[in-house]
Amino acid sequence: CKAMHVAQPAVVLASSRGIASFVCEYASPGKATEVRVTVLRQADSQVTEVCAATYMMGNELTFLDDSICTGTSSGNQVNLTIQGLRAMDTGLYICKVELMYPPPYYLGIGNGTQIYVIDPEPCPDSDF
């Protein structure tokens, strides 16, 4: 069976600054040189693309300049960081990996990481 398995943590809690990081790991059935990683958000049965990046093995992940995602790669592992998260962004974040080149193409989709985001309490006014 030449399928591609993608693993990611079940739950991640975003920091008070609205930053969440998780690892997306894939078991490559072939020797890919070009990989595309997409983060999908699923909430209320709606699916939206959060960000996507294509990278050459051994090189850094490059997301678009206006992307809320950053990441680094090491072998078959991608370390993803999503920034600017607010409580309304709580949801299931799914890692989708595609081995683009060389042929054959392979698709792998993780089970998703539930990211919980809690908006920080506003600081109380002080007399100081």
């Epitope: 069976c1 030449k2 399928a3 591609m4 059935p29 070009e34 595309r36 997409t38 999908l40 699916v47 693309e49 996507a52 294509t54 989708k96 595609e98 683009m100 080149y101 042929p103 054959p104 193409y105 392979y106 698709l107 792998g108 989709i109």
Partner: antibody
């Protein structure tokens, strides 16, 4: 709304060429891989080709490799299929289809008929 | 290349009956979809990931299975369900379809 509309089909002689187009609307075209699938009269579905995202990666079915070329113009939200050295067995309805977020073909065009006959 | 074999070729049933369609793969597949096609129309995605219903698909359609054996079930056939159904694997290239099962009115 989200849709794909094919055009360019027609009757052509064996050995000649034809170019099909597929106009996309209602979604961010450059974020999706797009396929061509064909269906010979009274037959089943046959995958033909795919082009991914920015157009740098393309895959073809063995039956069309070396004769057909898939391309896309993201600025025009349009997919193309250049068909050369056409054969009678290429006669079919040609559909373009979007590979959705999960990979399955979630949006299809209405199809355009290509008839290769002398 | 993964070969998908659908059975039966034709299924003759009456409205209200249950339809069970089979799709068998020549090797294990991770990603399988089901499509419905009516005469003169383009295919329509019903099920992806073997068991997830596509947007807007009625819950009388359900998919199950894993590995090499997959099933599409239509719990109660409506008049508009009489059509040809195709399975497809999409987890690796080349993408392949089954030969189709025709569900016709008995």
């Amino acid at each position: 709304q989200v849709q794909l509309v094919e055009s360019g089909g027609g009757v052509v002689q064996p050995g000649r060429s034809l170019r099909l187009s597929c106009a996309a609307s209602g979604f961010t075209f450059s974020s999706y891989g797009t396929h061509w699938v064909r269906q010979a009269p009274g037959k089943g579905l046959e995958w033909v080709a795919v082009i991914w995202y920015d157009g740098s990666n393309k895959y073809y079915a063995d039956s069309v490799k070396g004769r057909f070329t898939i391309s896309r113009d993201n600025s025009k939200n349009t997919l193309y299929l250049q068909m050369n050295s056409l054969r009678a067995e290429d006669t079919a309805i040609y559909y373009c289809a979007r590979a959705g977020n999960w990979g399955a073909f979630d949006i299809w065009g209405q199809g355009t008929m290509v008839t290769v006959s002398s | 290349e993964i070969v998908l074999t659908q059975s039966p070729g034709t299924l003759s049933l009456s409205p209200g009956e249950r339809a069970t369609l089979s799709c068998r793969a020549s090797q294990s597949v991770s990603y399988l979809a089901w499509y419905q096609q009516k005469p003169g129309q383009a295919p329509r995605l019903l099920i992806y990931g073997a068991s997830s219903r596509a947007t807007g698909i009625p819950d009388r359609f359900s998919g199950s299975g894993s590995g090499t054996d997959f099933t599409l079930t239509i719990s109660r056939l409506e008049p508009e369900d009489f059509a040809v159904y195709y399975c497809q694997h999409y987890g690796s290239s080349p993408w392949t379809f089954g030969q189709g099962t025709k569900v016709e009115i008995k």
